[in-house]
Structures are given as C-alpha cells and as structure tokens.
Amino acid sequence: QGWQAFKNDATEIIPELGEYPEPPPELENNKTMNRAENGGRPPHHPFETKDVSEYSCRELHFTRYVTDGPCRSAKPVTELVCSGQCGPARLLPNAIGRGKWWRPSGPDFRCIPDRYRAQRVQLLCPGGEAPRARKVRLVASCKCKRLTRFHNQSELKDFGTEAARPQKGRKPRPRARSAKANQAELENAY
C-alpha cells in the first residue's frame, strides 16, 4: 500500500543554501519515500501561525537528480519531505521560555504529506539509448494528522495515507509550478 511501490535509486544530492548538516531523525526512517541520506533546508518560520489551534510541522526542501535504473534526470528536481514533531502551534518552540514545551500524550500527531503534485522529468540513459519522459510524484505540502492508538504502523510507514485532497471538482488545489518554472528557480539558486 501507499508508497511501497516507490522505485527510485537517486542518491545524488545537491545541497541548498543553509541546509541542515544532517537530516532530522524523522527523515531517516522514511526510506520508502526517498533514499536521500541528507539534504533539506531550515523551514521558513514553520511554527508561526495565525491560528493558535493549528498543528504545525516542517516542510524540508532538497534538490536532487532522480534515477530510473541506469537513467538519470537531465535536470534536478526539488523535493519536499514532511518532517518534525507535530504539536499545538502555540506550544511549539516559541513557548519554551514559558516552560510549556509540548509533550505528546494520548493521541499521536504525525507530519505527513497533504497534497501531491507531478513534475515532468526527462531521463537520460547511457549507451546511446533514447531519452525517456516520466512524471514523478512529489509532495506538494505537509500537514499534521492525528493518529489514534487504533491506527496501525503501516499507515506511518506509508506516510499517513489518510491525507485528504480537496474535492477536485469543486475546489482544485492551486496550480503547481511547471517543471520549467521549478528548473528556473533551481538554476537561479546556484
């Protein structure tokens, strides 16, 4: 189920400015989603929220080439990985000074993918083989999901596959940036 069908051998990471020297521990268990061993950058004020009742988690971005067998993407893609401990936004780091650091008790909250997007990838293959065109599934955003004790471990392994997408016929999610736009952004970053 979920992401078990994941097939990607990419390990070539392109560090981004201000990246973490090592990934948060949460990332290390998520090998079904990506095989990258490091990467990502600090979240943009992830715990600042207008709604204090909201639960927050981190969205880590990292850039890498993706591969399919011997073939590698002509250009890198920027991926997003959901990470971090979920907790009431008002009790996250800003509240440490007041001695109210949130500790999970009872229901468990996990940071999981909320929405997905596709990005076109051109794969270049060795030996004069023709290029391949594929669409890669990337996480578009993350959310905190409440997992009760009745949720089994497979859901955690599968990134909490209960993540919901808006009813697409009525309320489509914002248009994802095109592959070209993403690439332009990447190129400008170097």
Partner: antibody
Framework: EVQLVQSGAEVKKPGASVKVSCKVS????????MHWVRQAPGKGLEWMGG????????IYAQKFQGRVTMTEDTSTDTAYMELSSLRSEDTAVYYC??????????????WGQGTLVTVSS | QAVVTQEPSLTVSPGGTVTLTCGSS?????????PYWFQQKPGQAPRTLIS???DKHSWTPARFSGSLLGGKAALTLSGAQPEDEAEYYC?????????FGGGTKLTVL
C-alpha cells in the same frame, strides 16, 4: 495494490442525470489520479476527464464540458462522476481508472469493473 | 481537439511479428505525449500494456514492446500468441488532456 469497485448498472430517461461511484481500496484517493473513460456498445474508449496532478486540477474533455462533474470524497475514498442532460448516445459502460501510486506516475493502471448506463425513454 | 489515429485492423500469424502505430493529427508523436497502450478483450475492462512510450508493467508479456517509430508511437508484438487477439488502444497526453485512438482490432490467424 489499488482496487476499484464501481456502482451498479443504471437505467435513465433522456434529460436525466446519472452519478456513478468508484470506491478505492489499497491506497487512499488523495494519493491517486482518478480518470473516467466510457465505451459505447461496439465502440472505442473515450476519455471524459480526470485529475491532472501536474496542474493540480480536474480537466474535462471538451465534449463533456458543462455536462460532467467529477468529485471525490476523501473521507470514504470514493470518486464520483455525474453526467447530466443524458441522451441515448450516452448509453455506454463507464469506467474509472487510476494510476498505480508510487514514485512514478503511471496513469490508467487500475480499472474499475465498469458501470453500464442505459439511457432509454 | 487532437485526433489520434490507429490502423482499424491488422492480422498476424501465430509466432509472427506485427507493429501497431499511433499517430497524432497535430504532427509528430514524441516522448512528451507519454504514449500508452492498452489491450481489451470482449467483455473485459482495458488492461495497460505500456506506459510512457516504452515502460512495461509487471503483467506485460515480454513479447510486447513500445517505441517511437517514424513520428508515431508504436506497439510491436514479436511472437504473437492466439491469446493476443484483442482490441488495442493507444492514448496520448496533450498537456493535461488525454485522447484515445480509435483502436486496432488484432487478429491472430
């Protein structure tokens, strides 16, 4: 593995609407790209519309625009296709089809069993 | 809207080789059309054989292969079996829009 189970056959009168459901199991609907395809008796496959994960929106075939609505209930992992202003030429088997999940998008990998909609006065 | 064309019917001898093609009214078919090939037998739902030009699936027999040939998408069947007799459909992506071909009735005779 993704499995799709569609609602049963329907008989409708011209001018009426029909709503076909497609229940997903094995994955959650929010992970998948759902499309709808129909096939009139003795004819070929005809794409009606589906979710484009690159654009993040549902796209409808020009032919059906204004007459078809595709929605999803992620709480029950059920997709719906509603076709209005039915005419006799809408008599067909209606299929839902999704990608296989996983890292690479592979569309139309899993198909429902089909729902026969008969439009007759 | 684009029109996707296929041979209406083809015949192949058992053990023989046949190539089905899929053309586009808009011009040359490229990898950016992400050609798909489906097999459908009477009374059954379609079954995907090839995705993204040449990508086979776990259930796709090795005798089927996808490629681009002379500006069209192609499905080649090498070593035809009686059970390969079916209707074959191609599909092309035009951005987010999808268009099916009219289908090729393949007879193994």
């Amino acid at each position: 593995e993704v499995q799709l189970v569609q609602s049963g056959a329907e008989v409708k009168k011209p001018g009426a609407s029909v709503k076909v459901s497609c229940k997903v199991s094995g994955y959650t609907l929010s992970e998948l790209s759902m499309h709808w395809v129909r096939q009139a008796p003795g004819k070929g496959l005809e794409w009606m519309g589906g979710f484009d994960p690159e654009g993040g929106e549902t796209i409808y075939a020009q032919k059906f625009q204004g007459r078809v609505t595709m929605t999803e209930d992620t709480s029950t992992d059920t997709a719906y296709m509603e076709l209005s202003s039915l005419r006799s030429e809408d008599t067909a088997v209606y299929y839902c089809a999704t990608d296989a999940g996983g890292y690479w998008y592979k569309f139309f990998q899993h198909w429902g069993q089909g729902t026969l909609v008969t439009v007759s006065s | 809207q684009a029109v996707v064309t296929q041979e209406p019917s083809l015949t192949v001898s058992p053990g023989g080789t046949v190539t089905l093609t899929c053309g586009s009214s808009t011009g040359t078919v490229t990898i950016d059309h992400y050609p798909y090939w489906f097999q459908q037998k009477p009374g059954q739902a379609p079954r995907t054989l090839i995705s993204d030009t040449d990508d086979k699936h776990s259930w796709t027999p090795a005798r089927f292969s996808g490629s681009l040939l002379g500006g069209k998408a192609a499905l080649t069947l090498s070593g035809a079996q009686p059970e390969d007799e079916a209707e074959y459909y191609c599909l092309l992506f035009y951005g987010g829009t999808v268009v099916f071909g009219g289908g090729t009735k393949l007879t193994v005779l």
